[in-house]
């Protein structure tokens, strides 16, 4: 219980806002407001899940209004820490008493905010078809009378090509809008930056997304192809696997060929590139083939298209269901 000769502080934590798309920025600021106390020595400590945090992460300032004082302390957190669901506490020691307030990331609410994504061209489109495109994808839009505008531009200020637009209503009632822009192969390879600007009456501000050729080290993919052995009960089907690894950057296209003809993408299943922690990226690709196919010609080719592969940006490996026959 506080004695009557001082007024205890009120402690309140405020949190920095999300960006226009409803996403958390790379860093989050927590502001601890300690207000309305009789001037005197005050000690502010930040806790993470009950543990004292590094004081270097926070800054504090005090002001006096009439007979009462206020102090504020700001804590900067990385997005990773904030999203990890830890609890952050501002603990105030004053006149031998402790006052505190705690906060943590709120549970995701429905519906989520609008998100925009901008893809890079696939290596297949860039190096084989030589007609690269980039796609601006806007998801989680609430269907409304307002029009979503997607505007393309280039950092160089040069004009952009004509884009194609598609709108799709999703099962959950939200709207997805995509705009696909053809880009020049040389422009892309030489490092041009493309921007997609998304505006909508219900968005507090425009969403801007940009994309350009990935910088950083280059490494060509290694390709290994395998056939699984015959499995009881499935004599007329066989699974082929392709491991593609140690490539950088992560952009890669994977194709399977039979009889010198590229098989439709729907025929195979390929993982997203994963990091190896030091050797580059890897993907696995899986293709199911039928007896009719391998009896016609028992050679299947797994091909990777990647900018660091030479010659002609492709590496491929052949695999047979029954090698040696």
């Amino acid at each position: 219980v506080c004695s009557r000769d001082f007024t205890p502080p009120t402690v309140k934590i405020l949190q920095s806002s999300c960006d226009g798309g409803g996403h958390f920025p790379p860093t989050i600021q927590l502001l601890c407001l300690v207000s309305g106390y009789t001037p005197g020595t005050i000690n502010i400590t930040w806790l993470e899940d009950g543990q004292v945090m590094d004081v270097d992460l926070s800054t504090a300032s005090t002001t006096q209004e009439g007979e009462l004082a206020s102090t504020q302390s700001e804590l900067t957190l990385s997005q990773k820490h904030w999203l990890s669901d830890r609890t952050y506490t501002c603990q105030v020691t004053y006149q031998g008493h402790t006052f505190e307030d705690s906060t943590k990331k709120c549970a995701d609410s429905n519906p989520r905010g609008v998100s925009a994504y901008l893809s890079r061209p696939s290596p297949f489109d860039l190096f084989i078809r030589k007609s690269p495109t980039i796609t601006c994808l806007v998801v989680d839009l609430a269907p409304s009378k307002g029009t979503v505008n997607l505007t393309w531009s280039r950092a160089s200020g040069k004009p952009v090509n004509h884009s194609t637009r598609k709108e799709e209503k999703q099962r959950n009632g939200t709207l997805t809008v995509t705009s696909t822009l053809p880009v020049g192969t040389r422009d892309w390879i030489e490092g041009e930056t493309y921007q997609c600007r998304v505006t909508h009456p219900h968005l507090p501000r425009a969403l801007m997304r940009s994309t350009t050729k990935t910088s950083g080290p280059r490494a060509a993919p290694e390709v290994y192809a395998f056939a699984t052995p015959e499995w009881p009960g499935s004599r007329d089907k066989r699974t082929l696997a392709c491991l593609i690894q140690n490539f950088m950057p992560e952009d890669i296209s994977v194709q399977w060929l039979h009889n010198e003809v590229q098989l439709p993408d729907a025929r195979h299943s390929t993982t997203q590139p994963r990091k190896t922690k030091g050797s580059g990226f890897f993907v696995f690709s899986r293709l199911e083939v039928t007896r009719a196919e391998w009896e016609q010609k028992d050679e299947f080719i797994c091909r990777a298209v990647h900018e660091a592969a030479s010659p002609s940006q492709t590496v491929q490996r052949a695999v047979s269901v029954n090698p040696g026959k």
Epitope: P26, T27, D54, D56, T76, L77, S78, Q79, K80, G216, M248, E250, K275, T276, K277, G278, G280, F281
Partner: nanobody, 122 residues
Framework: EVQLLESGGGLVQPGGSLRLSCAAS????????MAWVRQAPGKRYEWVSS????????HYADSVKGRFTISRDNAKNTLYLQMNSLRPEDTAEYWC???????????????YGQGTLVTVSS
């Protein structure tokens, strides 16, 4: 948007020194571990060094230990690599890099700068 811009590369004689800088913008630099990586012509890329957010924890590849020093100035949003006793085998493109998850050792980083070329030759 994360942006990294390296500078300080150039031609230096064996045994000489260079200091690379990396100016960061578009993110809270002081909240991210940072790294330097390099790639010699025709060779695989190599992680060189990493430093934690506060600059207290540093790691080095065996090939540069005792010769290179990584440091950072969070007030200036800048990462440095002091390279002493340079050898011809240090000739490479050097990039500063960071990652949303892990940048304190070898990795395929989320973000790289445009690179700066270091040539060690007499």
């Amino acid at each position: 948007e994360v942006q990294l811009l390296e500078s300080g590369g150039g031609l230096v004689q064996p045994g000489g020194s260079l200091r690379l800088s990396c100016a960061a913008s578009g993110f809270r630099f002081g909240n991210y571990d940072m790294a330097w990586v390099r790639q010699a012509p025709g060779k695989r890329y190599e992680w060189v060094s990493s430093i934690d957010t506060g600059g207290d924890i540093t790691h080095y590849a065996d090939s540069v230990k005792g010769r290179f020093t990584i440091s950072r100035d969070n007030a200036k949003n800048t990462l440095y690599l002091q390279m002493n006793s340079l050898r011809p085998e240090d000739t490479a493109e050097y990039w500063c890099a960071t990652d949303e998850e892990y940048a304190l050792g070898p990795n395929e980083f989320d973000y790289y700068g445009q690179g700066t070329l270091v040539t060690v030759s007499s």
